[in-house]
Interface confidence: low
């Protein structure tokens, strides 16, 4: 079969809106299925027209009722033949028209009376386009070449600017970029302790409004009461918005409050958050733990802890852990000195240690307690110790 | 005057992904086709595909269908291939070449006349 | 997956005519085209659709090509002219491109 295209140059350049007839003739084939390609893909959705000329010669027309340039390409048409393919030597179409943006003013945020640019592109065909400015309803200089960037040396209210693009078949205007004013940031709020110890607290919070510039730190100041002496004060890299001061003082009163800047300077501090560092947890472990057997079971006796320092708190109550060999074990909270323990095994040896305790937490263990099981009583020494008599 | 501009030479690890570019100037992007050739060292020359004016449609060689990904940025006239996952296999010297020459007989898709340096992909672990 | 079979090499002495074969089912409805190699350099084109010379190209290249066999013929190899030659075609549904194994042409 022989296939061209006919009644079309190499380069076929319409304006946009005009109808265009591609024409393809086929020799050699009775009622051929002439098929229309456009960049690789096969034309389905448009019309297409068959012209018998002679019994082995037909002319396939692809009619384009309106060309946009979305239509641009390179066409050509194809028949099967004998499970072969044959195609046609191409055609390039162009569509002009109006200019078409391949670049639009985009929207800013940027510091008042700061310099800035605006950036638009558009293209043809037909070449050449030009591009003219607008700031708000007015036209900002002459004509200029696409691509053209417009310097703006500052604005000091939100503005908006757009770009017009001409060439010989008009004129097209460009989405409108807005340049907004950055500013300071708001204060931050939800400010959280969210975790506490005797030294250490974490404290997160939320961002207020960034004042369209990218948040760039914040500082937690930490005082001991509202308005005093500044005690901590710490600059975070953000985000995540949140810090952990170290190094406080146990079961002390505080205030921190937060900030946070941008390239243009600092938020207003948020409002003071009082926190409670917690206590310390007892130093000391009760002294001379001993066991007295009874006919009801044991007994068991320690020496009261009395409280080291202040920051420790009020002592009490203590708690008492025991196992035995056979991988029974208990703990049990007593109020005083003295325990009287129940359910264990007389047959099988006891370990029992005691500790105090306060809000924080349990202090050290004492030393462990070995009650033999042949023993009618036992003493504090190493967990492998035997006391007989 | 035509240019192809190439990214730098470039060496993965197998498994890593990566993305070469091609530049083009001296012309309109959008007037012609860009075709990526593999050549391995001291092999020969592999079609590996090729890219529409528009970037619309993509043709693939039957050894890199699903292997590699052919596109292109018409704003910044940049031609890109890419790859998910490289290979040993994958270390080779790539060219972009421009598909389509103008010719007294018309414009020809396959009139491979300009072609890009080269860019190096080694894969080694 | 179409193939284009080309011989690894050929030599001639100065002067001599050098040619090289490619052959693939597809090349009576398809064009060849034929692309020069010289070490470390990109591929130049030489030949395309089947027997036109591309700029700048010498008047000693030319192309032929007769059912499944296409021909790039040197008539008065050069010194210069030592280098790889790549054929190229489309497969047959037109839907991917093709390089022949390519020849290694020395001019001793």
């Known amino acids: 079969a022989g296939l061209k295209l006919m009644g079309a140059p190499v380069k076929l350049t319409v304006s946009q809106g005009q109808p265009v007839k591609l024409n393809c003739s086929v020799e050699g084939m009775e009622e051929p299925d002439i098929q229309w390609v456009k960049d690789g893909a096969v034309v389905q959705n448009l019309d297409q027209l068959y012209i018998p000329v002679s019994e082995q010669h037909w002319i396939g027309f692809l009619s384009l009722k309106s060309v946009e340039r979305s239509d641009a390409g390179r066409y050509w048409c194809q028949v099967e033949d004998g499970g072969e393919t044959e195609i046609s030597q191409p055609v390039w179409l162009t569509v002009e028209g109006v200019p078409f943006f391949t670049v639009e003013p985009k929207d800013l945020a940027v510091p008042p009376n700061a310099p800035f640019q605006l950036s638009c592109e558009a293209v043809g065909p037909p070449e050449p386009v030009t591009i003219v400015w607008w700031r708000g309803t007015t036209k900002i200089g002459g004509p200029a070449p696409s691509p053209s960037v417009l310097n703006v040396t500052g604005v000091t209210q939100s503005t908006m600017f757009s770009c017009e693009a001409h060439n010989l078949k008009g004129l097209a205007s460009s989405r409108t970029a807005t340049v907004h004013l950055q500013a300071l940031p708001a204060a931050p709020f939800n400010i959280t302790v969210t975790k506490l110890s005797s030294s250490n607290a974490s404290v997160a919070w939320m961002p207020g409004a960034d004042g369209r510039a990218l948040l760039q730190s914040c500082t937690v100041q930490v005082t001991q009461a509202p308005g005093g002496w500044e005690v901590l004060a710490v600059v975070v890299p953000v985000p995540p918005f949140t810090c952990l001061l170290r190094d406080l003082v146990p079961a002390t009163n505080y205030s921190l409050r937060v900030r946070c800047a941008n390239a243009l300077g600092p938020s207003p501090y948020a409002d003071w958050v009082p926190f409670q560092t917690k206590g310390l947890a007892p130093a000391s472990a009760p002294q001379n733990l001993h066991a007295i057997r009874t006919d009801s079971g044991l007994i068991l006796e320690w020496e009261e802890v009395i409280p080291e320092a202040p920051l420790e708190g009020p002592l009490g109550p203590y708690k008492l852990s025991w196992v035995q060999d056979n991988g029974t074990q208990d703990e049990l909270t007593v109020e005083g000195t003295r325990a009287n323990l129940t359910g264990w095994d007389p047959q099988k040896d006891l370990i029992v240690r005691v500790c105090v305790s306060n809000a924080v937490g349990c202090g050290p263990w004492s030393q462990p307690l070995v009650v033999s099981s042949h023993d009618r009583a036992g003493q504090q020494g190493p967990p492998h110790s035997r006391t007989s008599w | 005057e035509v240019q192809l501009v190439q990214s730098g030479a470039d060496v993965k690890k197998p498994g890593a992904s990566l993305t070469i570019s091609c530049q083009a100037s001296?012309?309109?992007?959008?007037?012609?086709?860009i075709s990526w050739v593999r050549q391995k060292p001291g092999k020969g020359l592999e079609w590996m595909g090729r890219i529409s004016r528009h970037g619309s449609q993509t043709y693939y060689g039957p050894s890199f269908q699903g292997h590699v990904t052919i596109s292109a940025d018409r704003s910044t006239a940049t031609a890109y291939l890419q790859w998910r996952s490289l290979e040993a296999s994958d270390t080779a010297m790539y060219y972009c070449?421009?598909?389509?020459?103008?010719?007294?007989?018309?414009?020809?898709?396959?009139?491979?006349?300009?072609w890009g340096p080269g860019t190096l992909v080694t894969v080694s672990s | 997956s179409y193939e284009l079979t080309q011989p690894p090499s050929v030599s001639v002495s100065p002067g001599q005519t050098a040619r090289i074969t490619c052959s693939g089912d597809a090349l009576p409805k398809k064009y060849a085209y034929w692309y020069q190699q010289k070490s470390g350099q990109a591929p130049v084109l030489v030949i395309y659709?089947?027997?036109k010379r591309a700029s700048g190209i010498p008047e000693r290249f030319s192309g032929s090509s007769s059912g499944t066999m296409a021909t790039l013929t040197i008539s008065g190899a050069q010194v210069e002219d030592e280098a790889d030659y790549y054929c190229y075609s489309i497969s047959p549904a037109g839907n991917y491109g093709v390089f022949g194994g390519g020849t290694k042409l020395t001019v001793l």
């Open positions: 070449v421009r598909a389509g020459g103008q010719t007294s007989g018309g414009t020809i898709p396959e009139y491979y006349q300009h």
């Open positions: 001296g012309y309109t992007f959008t007037d012609y086709w």
């Open positions: 659709e089947d027997h």
